[in-house]
Each structure stands twice: as C-alpha cells, then as structure tokens.
C-alpha cells in the first residue's frame, strides 16, 4: 500500500501499521515485547528483542554487556546502543598499546622525541609519537613546533624508560643488540581525565526503557532483554560480565549488551596468570632504567622505539622510577624483547630486564 | 487477559527434588522472561532467576546456582522450576512472574506453589 | 550484590494520613537517566502485585494515592491517603544488577 502519502493516515485501516506524523507515512507497529531499531519500522525485522541495562544485542541475537570506560586512561568514544557495545578509546595524549575489543586494553603516553629527534608524526589515539632526526642545523631541542610543546602528563626522566615492547610485534624476531627494546612511559599517576560523555539519558542509545508495543503469539521475530551487567554472547545467551572489583585490577573496557566487561592489572602490575576477559594473578612490574636513543619507525598501535645503549652500559633495575610512582601495567600479550634463550625460565635478578613467556610467567633476558 | 497458573502444593523427602510448573496464556510466552522468586514462611522475598522461553536463555541467582533449574517449553507455553537436594530451607512459596520488557518489573504473577521439605 | 536497606520494618497509620516507606539501595540504581527501583505491595496468601515502577512510575489500575520518588540510592513509597485496603506487606526491588534483590519489606497497619 502506499507509504507515503500524508493523507494515508489509516493505513488503509491495516491493525498491525500506524501512522507517524513526523515523518508522514504509515510504519510498521513492533509486536508487544519488542522495540523498534527505527524510528519508523517498516517490517518485523525491524523489531527487536530489549536487553538489560548496559547490554546490547550482539550478532547473535544475545544480549551482552557493553565495555565500559570507567578507567582513569580511558574516555567514551560512542555510547553503549542497543544493537552496539560503547566504543572506549584511550584519552587524549595516550595512545592504544594494545586493542581490546570495542576499547584498549592498555594505554601508554605519547613519547616525547628525545634530543636530536623531532616529530615526524603525532601521537594520536592509536599510534604513539613518530619520531625522526632532526635535520642538520636545526635546534634538536625545538626542532618542530610538536616537540616544542610540554608533554599533556609528566614523563619518566629519558634516562630511565620503562621497558616494554610492543602488543603486536613482528620485531621480537629482531636481532636484539646488549639488551632490550625499551619504550618511553610516562610514570606520573594517571589523572582522571574530563568525563566522557554519558549515554545515560541519551534516546540514541536508550537501551529500550521506553513502552514497548505487543509481542503476539507465535512472533519469530520477538527478541529479548538482558538484566544490566550482562552481555548477550556470541551463542545469544545472556551472561554475566566480568568484575575488576579486586583490588588489583582495573576496568579495561566496560560491559556492553553484546561484549563484556574486561579487566587488567592496575598500574604497577603485570599479569603473570591470564583469564577471560581478565587476570587471575597480577604481579609487581618491574621497572629498568637505561640511556636510550630513539630509532623512528610508523606502525599502528606500537610504541615509539628505542635502540639500547652499546654493550657495557646494560640497564639496572629499580623497583620504581625515581618520582616513586609505578608504570601502568602490561597485559599478558606484551613482553620486554628477548634473545633465543627467553624461552627458559630462570630465577630473575634485580638487574634483569624481564618478559612473559606464553605462558605469562616471567622469564629472564639472557642478554 | 494474562495469566500464570502455577502447579499444585509439594510435600518432597529431604534430599530429593521437585519441578513445579508455571502455565503462561493470555500473552507471547516466548517473548518475555519469566522469573521465579522464592519467598519462606514469613520472609522477605528472594529472586531466584529467570528465563528465556524463545530460546532458553537464563540468568541465576548465585545462591541458587545448583540448586534451581529453569527450563521452559514453548509449545505448551509452561515454565518450569526444578529444585535439587531438598533441605527444610528450601520450603518455601516458589512465585514465577512475568518480567517486562522496558523497566524490568514483574507485572503478572503466578499464584505460588508451596513446596514443603520434610522428612 | 545491591543490598536494599528498607525502613520502618513495620509503620501504624491512622486512616487518612500519610504512610512513607523508605528504601535505601547500597549502590547507584541509575540507569539511562530513570532508577530502576520497583515497588510492590503483598497481602496475606496472595502474590505481590506491582505497584510502582522505574522508581515514581504507577502502574496502570494502580490508585493514584501511591507515589514513588527518589533517584540513585534512595527511593521512598508513598501511599496517602491510606485506606483499609492498603493494609499489606511493600517491597522495594532493584533491577539494576544481577541478582536481583528485595528489600526485606516494610508491614504497614492502621492505628
């Protein structure tokens, strides 16, 4: 019948279509315990089934829990949907280490190009800081007007980087020359950043606490709703999303209707026993110190790189950096790089650089 | 107009198990969750868990992890509760009760099945 | 969990006057801008019947001498002005987090 015609304002007398004033034609009445993904459905297939609270309905038709951004490096991209978990990003001067599903996992400053590199390309919400040499006869110091800016939160003194390598990471095939690689992390406490912007009273994102419309028997087409802090999975069953309650651990990615919740050590500490969608085992992280000159390089989601000083002058460890603060934790996926013989697991000295077997236990750089 | 008729009084041995059943009519069986609260003799109210009659889905108390069993058949739109290892705790009046879709209230209820536990 | 701290435990009201039932949740109920806080009322031998949703919502065929209000952690009941029929067990429940929980119910009597 037709559709859009202001005057069709019966539908032709059709129950199971009304007539929208707005947008001037007859739309398609969602069956009761079913919410509209529209604001004029046109067919069942635009009806849905309402999960609970900070839940989406994933592919699958399950509700899941939508990520949250609760922490303290993270801010809220898009809110959490009805059809789409909240997407978190990492706060402005931080950039991604390593990407966790709908958020990061783990946030690291942007570097700050040391002496004699400039800024090739800023960090950005994904990449770290690119650096470059400076050309000759420009001031190393104030080579470009990026690197002339103070950093948006204090910096470990260049001395004293924390080792790290990157989450994704081809090079842990590289020769590595009298150590480790090590990238630049800011060690001042993280500060809350501005708040994200809420979806709480957002009807973009309302998850369907709105009246709902009949649901008649025998609808296919009836999805369902999950309680709050459950997330429909991949197999559409609600389940619950993980907790970060313990005092260890932090909320990575918040819990959305389609993803749940995931947690990470807090800043300080290394995961040594992974979970799902979280860690069993947190440990102190142990932190190097070493000179450092910046090699550049330009890939996604990995931090500025670091060639280690010549043989003879291997980094000693201290237990924090010297402003006493901790680093922010590494997820099980990262490791400092390490030779051949990393793969064994040996006692660990203070002094040793230190990286995570597969199986998360730490292993010592045999150097 | 919607109604839940729930099953008749249990009086079940120590250590056994029972199911009692909710018969959903009036309204899509499929579509809502159904929900079971279990309240004792001059008690408060305790939420057991609730399910998914379109496709089985279920959430649970933790407390009731191992002890209650929700399943649910479409065709005959019944819900059912299934109680494990019975001890004098568990008598009590079981309710199951519609949840709405939208605020999450339980708008219709069953008339409550009283299971009694004695030896 | 989220405790809910409900108060009185029991309250005498004379008829005509104003019954107030307090609930206190242990944590935040918000949820996309309402509370979801839910009110019932339960009377001897019957199923609780819902009366109050999304914290200050009645339910259809509800009489409009209840009320609820409230926001984030605490929720009242109102009923005023009280009848006979009223006499009854109330029930505050959150459906923030699962579990679900009750609060543990407030006895209302008339003086």
């Known amino acids: 019948f037709p559709q859009d015609r202001p005057f069709e304002d019966t539908c032709h007398g059709n129950p199971s279509h009304y007539y929208d004033k707005a947008v001037r034609r007859c739309c398609y009445r969602c069956p009761m315990g079913l919410f509209p993904t529209q604001q004029c459905p046109q067919r069942p297939t635009d009806c849905r089934k309402q999960c609970e609270p900070d839940y989406y309905l994933d592919e699958a038709d399950r509700c899941t829990a939508c990520v949250t951004c609760s922490r303290d490096d993270l801010v809220e991209k898009t809110p959490c949907a009805w059809n789409s978990s909240r997407v978190c990003e990492c706060r402005p001067g931080m950039f991604c280490s390593t990407s966790a599903v709908n958020s990061c996992a783990r946030c690291f400053f942007h570097s700050v190009c040391p002496a004699g590199m400039i800024v090739k390309f800023p960090g950005t919400a994904q990449k770290n800081t690119v650096c470059e040499p400076a050309s000759p006869g420009v001031s190393p110091a104030c080579a470009s007007p990026e690197n002339c800016k103070e950093p948006s939160s204090g910096t470990i003194p260049q001395a004293k980087p924390t080792p790290v390598s990157p989450a994704t990471s081809s090079a842990s095939t590289m020769p590595v020359r009298g150590g480790t690689r090590l990238a630049q992390e800011a060690a001042s406490k993280l500060t809350r950043a501005p708040d994200s912007p809420s979806s709480v009273g957002r009807p973009s994102s309302d998850p369907g606490l709105s009246p709902t419309q009949p649901c008649p028997e025998g609808s296919g087409d009836c999805r369902k709703q999950c309680e709050p802090d459950y997330y429909l999975d991949e197999a559409g069953r609600c389940t619950a999303c993980v907790s970060c309650s313990r005092d260890d651990l932090v909320e990575k990615t918040p819990c959305a209707w389609n993803s749940s919740r995931t947690c990470e050590c807090r800043p300080g500490m290394i995961c040594a026993t992974s979970a799902t969608n979280s860690c069993a085992r947190c440990v102190p992280y142990p932190i190097c110190a070493a000179e450092t000159v910046t090699k550049p390089q330009d890939m996604a989601e990995k931090d500025t790189t670091f060639e280690a000083p010549p043989l003879g002058t291997q980094p000693d460890c201290n237990p924090t950096p010297e402003n006493g603060e901790a680093p922010a934790s590494t997820s099980p996926t990262q490791s400092l790089l390490v030779d051949s013989q990393a793969s064994k697991t040996l006692p660990i000295p203070t002094s040793a650089p230190v990286a995570l077997s597969s199986t998360g236990k730490p292993v010592l750089d045999a150097g | 107009e919607v109604q839940l008729q729930q099953s008749g009084a249990e009086l079940v041995r120590p250590g056994s198990s029972v199911k009692i059943s909710c018969k959903a009519s009036?309204?899509?069986?499929?579509?809502?969750?159904m929900n079971w609260v279990k309240q004792r003799p001059g008690q408060g109210l305790e939420w057991i868990g609730q399910?998914?009659?379109?496709?089985?889905?279920?959430n649970y108390n933790g407390k009731f992890k191992g002890k209650a069993t929700l399943t649910a058949d479409k065709s005959s739109s019944t819900a059912y509760m299934q109680l494990s290892s019975l001890t004098s705790e568990d008598s009590a009046v079981y309710f199951c009760?519609?949840?709405?879709?939208?605020?999450?209230?339980?708008?219709?209820w069953g008339q409550g099945t009283s299971v009694t536990v004695s030896s | 969990e989220i405790v809910l701290t409900q108060s009185p435990a029991s309250l005498a009201v004379s008829l005509g006057q104003r019954a107030t039932i307090s609930c206190r949740a242990s944590e935040s109920l918000e949820y996309y801008g309402t509370s979801l806080m839910l009110w019932y009322q339960q009377k001897p031998g019957q199923p609780p019947k819902l009366l109050i949703y999304s914290a200050s919502n009645v339910e259809s065929g509800v009489p409009a001498r209840f009320s609820g209000s409230g926001s984030g952690t605490d929720f009242s009941l109102n009923i005023h002005p009280v009848e006979e029929d009223d006499i009854a067990m109330y029930f505050c429940?959150?459906?923030?987090?699962?579990?679900?929980?009750f609060g543990g119910g407030t006895k209302l009597e008339i003086k």
């Open positions: 429940q959150q459906r923030r987090k699962v579990p679900s929980t």
């Open positions: 009036g309204y899509a069986f499929s579509s809502y969750w």
């Open positions: 009760a519609r949840r709405i879709n939208g605020n999450f209230a339980m708008d219709y």
């Open positions: 399910i998914y009659p379109g496709d089985g889905d279920t």
